[in-house]
């Protein structure tokens, strides 16, 4: 039959070349004379001339050494002609499989892996995979399968086995426990690839493991006892720097510390945060202290981390004794503001009051006080007793230094420490109004027609308060009455003033006397301008001149 | 001589607790990894439970998840397992073992725990 | 049932070898070096006899030798003695949580 089996050839053969592989033969071959030849790749047709085939006889041979990791299978067709040239068979189907040989090593992807595991880990715990590539073949033989294991590892600390690698996947994995980034923070491994599954060529690289940190170490302090001392009263005060020490990753969150105030600030007194760069605890006042009240204050300080711990760790814990120093303080006046009814327009020398400071210092310093500020010079005050008096005539009714009936006074107390210090009180004194005002008319110039007068409304103001204002009262006075009448609205807050017989043009005083509810009189004189006109007039017009 | 020494076992109720202790000497305990191993009457040998030698990774069989706790002090030199809602099933010998190298070696002589109401 | 699967009994005489096999897969047995054996009297704790496939620890008997092939480990006791009638437990390492494998037992008996 016209048919070939697949014909085996081993790579890298040694020959002689040209090899007789198999023959080619057609049972056409009785009837005439047959010509074999061959194409495809590998015969006619790149890589030519690797195969060729004696014409006559039909040998199929090769040229030269196979090599399978270059091409491991060739698919040639087998022809044969008459002497004619005239095809006797189809093209025959021969195929050529290069068999392998274990002509390669294993090579790892990487000269060096790189990988991670967190310390303190179990065995059974992935680390990293190894990955090696062998071309030679793996399906059909164990030339290209390779087998990968541990050479060494260093540091042998704790222990000389502990990691270990599967010997097919290449995954490395722990196998035993005692990783401890504090003591070793790496491990070189050399690894090794072996075809043969095990027992063929080997090729090494190396692969490191870096252990990552885990919190395993809590922060102590270093020194456990502080002494410190602050001046009274300072707020934002730095008090002391204490200083841990961590072994575990600079600048992780499992090394940056966490300060707690533990006891001993029982009124809130101080704060502490973290130094972001040297991770001391900053304490720091919130408040002010007092000596007086308490003159040394005795802190606990507990230092965690951000990140929490990964196992049960005893908490270091830190003592702090503040000492707080006395300070001279400044006179403190008790109200701070005080607020004093007094009556207007007392008499000069008259007391007002007395403002008085206390000293929170313990020794009994002399305070002395003066006015600091006095717009209107009012007041005066005695600086051993801190009796204020009146030295001028306190008027409620003063707009430019009275508002809402309150003078401010600003009144200072210093004590005769060293250096002296001054504190400072404000006096308001609320002005008890007096009937010193009289009701005034508004406008005070009216005009008026001599004929159907309008009659004038006059708005009654008077400075005082209620109840010395409205309802007002009104008269005439000098003999205004004459020629005038006033009278006072309902509401008591307006005087109508009418003309009430004819006067010739020209401007007349009314005499206008005006009392409020109190029967403080007051009087006022009314420019009249009386025109010639009837009804309402703004201006007298001029003299009417006829053509 | 590496020694350990088990105790805490006895007769409890299903539902129960029961703390176990290992006591180790002779070895740098918070070096090695621990594990309890359980023998169950007539049956063979069963791990229940591992942890690191800091404490800070720990392992358990399915069949105990959740229920059991594993724990050491190491100032102590001492394995802990915690037992709670205790089943009949659980009823065995338990060892304490030194896990390292992929081998438990050495061994304690054993506590039994008896669940049985 | 156990990870590893051992043979429930074997026997042999005074005098004679046997073997003891321990199979697993791939990714226990066929993966690792790690194998190890134990033997437990009645009454007893567990005591290692062979580690890392092969290696004995000081104190145990040279007639006790392993071997490995593929995904099945082997413990051979040669020279058998009446001491040697006990419970055979073989153990692998395997990576994840549950790192260590347990092989069910095999009664040896000394006839």
């Known amino acids: 039959d016209w048919v070939v089996a697949p014909i085996s050839v081993p790579e890298n053969g040694k020959g002689p070349f040209p090899q007789r592989l198999n023959q080619l033969k057609s049972n056409k071959d009785r009837d005439t004379k047959i010509f074999y030849s061959i194409t495809g790749p590998g015969a006619d047709s790149p890589p030519e001339g690797v195969f060729a085939v004696e014409k006559e006889t039909g040998w199929l041979l090769l040229n030269k050494p196979l090599d399978r990791e270059e091409i491991a299978k060739y698919e040639l067709f087998g022809h044969a002609v008459s002497e004619n040239g005239a095809s006797v068979e189809d093209p025959m189907n021969i195929s050529i499989i290069v068999t392998d040989q274990n002509d390669h090593k294993p090579k790892f992807t990487q000269d060096t892996f790189r990988g991670s595991v967190l310390e303190g880990v179990l065995p059974g715990t992935s680390v990293m995979q190894v990955t090696a590539t062998d071309e030679d073949d793996a399906i059909y033989t164990y030339n290209g399968v390779v087998a990968y294991s541990i050479h060494s590892q260093e540091p042998k600390d704790p222990h000389d086995l502990m990691f270990t690698i599967h010997r097919s996947t290449g995954t490395i994995s722990v196998i035993s426990s005692g990783l401890d980034r504090e003591k070793v923070p790496e491990y070189t491994l050399t690894i090794q690839a072996t075809d043969m599954d095990g027992d063929g060529s080997t090729t090494t690289a190396v692969a490191v493991v870096e252990i990552l940190d885990a919190n395993d170490n809590a922060p102590m302090f270093d020194p456990q006892k502080y002494e410190a001392h602050v001046p009274e009263n300072a707020v934002g005060h730095e008090v002391q720097r204490l200083t841990v020490t961590d072994l575990d990753a600079p600048n992780s969150p499992a090394w940056r510390a966490t300060y707690l105030i533990m006891g001993g600030d029982d009124g809130d007194h101080f704060t502490i945060t973290t130094h972001p760069e040297s991770n001391q605890g900053i304490l720091t006042t919130r408040k002010g202290l007092d000596f007086e009240a308490k003159n040394q204050h005795t802190l606990y300080v507990e230092v965690t981390n951000e990140a929490p711990f990964v196992l049960k760790l005893p908490t270091s814990t830190a003592t702090i004794v503040v000492h707080v120093e006395d300070v001279n303080e400044a006179p403190v006046f008790v109200p701070p503001s005080k607020v004093v009814e007094v009556q207007e327009g007392i008499p000069t020398g008259e007391p007002v009051c007395v403002y008085t400071a206390e000293d929170p210092d313990k020794e009994n310093q002399k305070i002395s006080y003066r006015i600091l500020r006095d717009p209107a010079g009012w007041l005066a005050m005695d600086p051993d007793s801190g009796q204020v008096t009146a030295v001028g005539t306190l008027d409620r009714e003063d707009e430019q230094f009275v508002r809402n009936n309150i003078y401010e006074v600003m009144v200072l107390a210093m004590d005769n420490g060293s250096p002296p210090t001054t504190g400072t009180g404000t006096l308001l004194l609320t002005l008890i109004d007096v009937n010193d005002h009289g009701p005034v008319p508004e406008p005070r110039q009216i005009t008026i027609c001599n004929q159907s007068p309008v009659r004038q409304v006059l708005n009654i103001t008077d400075k005082d308060l209620s109840p010395h204002t409205s309802p007002f009262q009104a008269q005439l006075t000098d003999d205004s009455d004459i020629y005038w009448t006033a009278e006072v609205n309902e509401e008591g807050d307006t005087v109508v003033l009418s003309l009430k017989k004819f006067l010739k043009q020209d401007t007349y005083d009314v005499h206008l006397s005006l009392s409020d509810h109190g029967n403080k009189e007051q009087l006022t004189v009314i420019r009249a301008t009386v025109c010639d006109c009837h009804g309402h007039v703004e201006t007298c017009p001029g003299p009417w001149k006829g053509g | 001589e590496v020694q350990l020494l088990e105790s805490g076992g006895g007769l409890v109720q299903p539902g129960g607790s029961l703390r176990l202790s290992c006591a180790a000497s002779?070895?740098?305990?918070?070096?090695?990894?621990m594990s309890w191993v359980r023998q169950a009457p007539g049956k063979g040998l069963e791990w229940v439970s591992a942890?690191?030698?800091?404490?800070?990774?720990?392992y358990y069989a399915d069949s105990v998840k959740g229920r059991f706790t594993i724990s050491r002090d190491n100032s102590k030199n001492t394995l802990y397992l915690q037992m709670n809602s205790l089943r009949a099933e659980d009823t065995a010998v338990y060892y304490c073992?030194?896990?390292?190298?992929?081998?438990?070696?050495?061994w304690g002589q054993g506590t039994m725990v008896t669940v049985s109401s | 049932q156990s990870a590893l699967t051992q043979p429930a009994s074997v026997s042999g005489s005074p005098g004679q070898s046997i073997t003891i096999s321990c199979t697993g897969t791939?990714?226990?047995?066929?993966?690792?070096?790690?194998v190890s054996w134990y033997q437990q009297h009645p009454g007893k704790a567990p005591k290692l006899i062979l580690s890392?496939?092969?290696k004995r620890p000081s104190g145990v008997s040279n007639r006790f030798s392993g071997s490995k092939s593929g995904n099945t480990a082997s413990l051979s006791i040669s020279g058998l003695q009446a001491e040697d009638e006990a419970d055979y437990y073989c153990?692998?390492?395997?990576?994840?949580?549950?790192?260590?494998?347990f092989g069910g037992g095999t009664k040896l008996t000394v006839l």
């Open positions: 153990t692998s390492y395997t990576m994840g949580s549950t790192f260590m494998l």
């Open positions: 791939s990714n226990d047995v066929g993966a690792y070096n790690y």
């Open positions: 890392e496939v092969n």
């Open positions: 002779g070895f740098t305990f918070s070096s090695y990894a």
């Open positions: 073992a030194d896990t390292n190298s992929a081998k438990f070696d050495p």
């Open positions: 942890i690191s030698g800091s404490g800070g990774s720990t």
